[in-house]
């Protein structure tokens, strides 16, 4: 069976939108208006691992684009890249273990733990226009909290 | 140090289930990011990646021999186990398994190997 | 599946020779490459990760290099103990796949 996915945007708690910064980073800011069309939009997909009722598999790509989010070590350090694949191979159910994050609700609000690297999180800096990074800290300056808005297809 | 030994039946016969069990000293399965591997080797012939099992209990397996193999764990006795139903002469091979971490999977420690030999 | 090609089956080369054996992947592997050293006693060893990362206790005579598809291992001053065969093993997408593998020898 195909893998399921759907088409969304993701804003931060603080309300600040993703947009792409060069051809392999995302920044978050605070976007208005006809800006808005700058925000990215992932096709979040279905994947294969652990699921219960509040934590749910999931690939994040890059709509009509070849590039998932990925986790990997770069330095010793879990680290968030865009990364390229070949479009006739993704998504796929059984994702690479690098592109994999846990989907997690919690009062409304999602978190996104890497599959890989358990407690790191899809993280934004409360600074305007920086990168979206993995972090390893909850509830501390950095944002881990998201919303997620649905886009038609 | 990180050992890795492999044990199997040696020799079995076509249509039989083939059992190998990886036993490690040195790390543990439950150490998040780890993973251990399966690597067969027919004599004379070039490596064939089979399975991986993660710390977490995520399996892979190669499409290619899926509906065949297994793969599991006991972390608690520092194993890894491979079952191959309905084997053939062609799965004669030396057997590896072998320990990485993280994906990108790079092997970083290997055991010696155990020769499977499938015949009639 | 991605194909993994050691187009170099055999090889011979002198001690002290500098030697390159190449791999290349059937589509781009984002340098998820990795190549391992087998003795002719079956013993396989890590040498290099991520296309040029040298493993602990490899010695320095190895290095990797490349990017995209073509790959390519280098011994610089080849030594009696590096007769072995070399397999390179692509990480960038599931089945991992090896190439055929290098024997190496000495002339």
């Known amino acids: 069976a195909p893998v399921r996915s759907l088409n969304c945007t993701l804003r931060d708690s603080q309300q600040k939108s993703l947009v792409m910064s060069g051809p392999y980073e995302l920044k978050a800011l605070h976007l208005q208006g006809q800006d808005m069309e700058q925000q990215v939009v992932f096709s979040m997909s279905f994947v294969q691992g652990e699921e219960s009722n509040d934590k749910i598999p999931v690939a994040l790509g890059l709509k009509e684009k070849n590039l998932y989010l990925s986790c990997v070590l770069k330095d010793d350090k879990p680290t968030l890249q865009l990364e390229s694949v070949d479009p006739k191979n993704y998504p796929k159910k059984k994702m690479e273990k690098r592109f994999v994050f846990n989907k997690i609700e919690i009062n409304n609000k999602l978190e996104f733990e890497s599959a890989q690297f358990p407690n790191w999180y899809i993280s934004t800096s409360q600074a305007e226009n920086m990168p979206v990074f993995l972090g390893g800290t909850k509830g501390g300056q950095d944002i881990t909290d998201f919303t997620m808005q649905f886009v038609s297809s | 140090q990180v050992t890795l030994k492999e044990s199997g039946p040696g020799i079995l016969k076509p249509s039989q289930t083939l059992s190998l069990t990886c036993s490690f000293s040195?790390?543990?399965?439950?150490?998040?990011?780890?993973?251990v591997g399966w690597i067969r080797q027919p004599s004379g012939k070039g490596l064939e990646w089979l399975a991986h099992?993660?710390?977490?209990?995520?399996?892979s397996y190669n499409p290619s021999l899926k509906t065949q193999l297994t793969i599991s764990k006991d972390t608690s006795r520092n194993q890894v186990f491979l079952k191959i139903t309905s084997v053939d002469t062609v799965d004669t091979a030396t057997y590896f398994c072998?320990?990485?971490?993280?994906?990108?999977?790079?092997?970083?420690?290997w055991g010696q190997g155990t020769l499977v030999t499938v015949s009639s | 599946d991605i194909q993994m090609t050691q187009t170099t089956s055999s090889l011979s080369a002198s001690l002290g020779d500098r030697v390159t054996i190449s791999c290349r992947a059937s589509q781009d592997i984002s340098n998820y490459l990795s190549w391992y050293q087998q003795k002719p006693d079956g013993t396989v060893k890590l040498l290099i990760y991520y296309t040029s990362k040298l493993h602990s206790g490899v010695p320095s005579r190895f290095s990797g290099s490349g990017s995209g598809t073509d790959y390519s291992l280098t011994i610089s001053n080849l030594e009696q103990e590096d007769i072995a065969t070399y397999f390179c093993l692509q990480g960038k997408m599931l089945p991992w796949t090896f190439g055929g593998g290098t024997k190496l020898e000495i002339k």
């Open positions: 040195g790390f543990s399965l439950s150490t998040s990011g780890m993973g």
């Open positions: 072998a320990r990485n971490r993280y994906d990108p999977p790079w092997f970083v420690d």
């Open positions: 099992i993660w710390w977490d209990g995520d399996e």
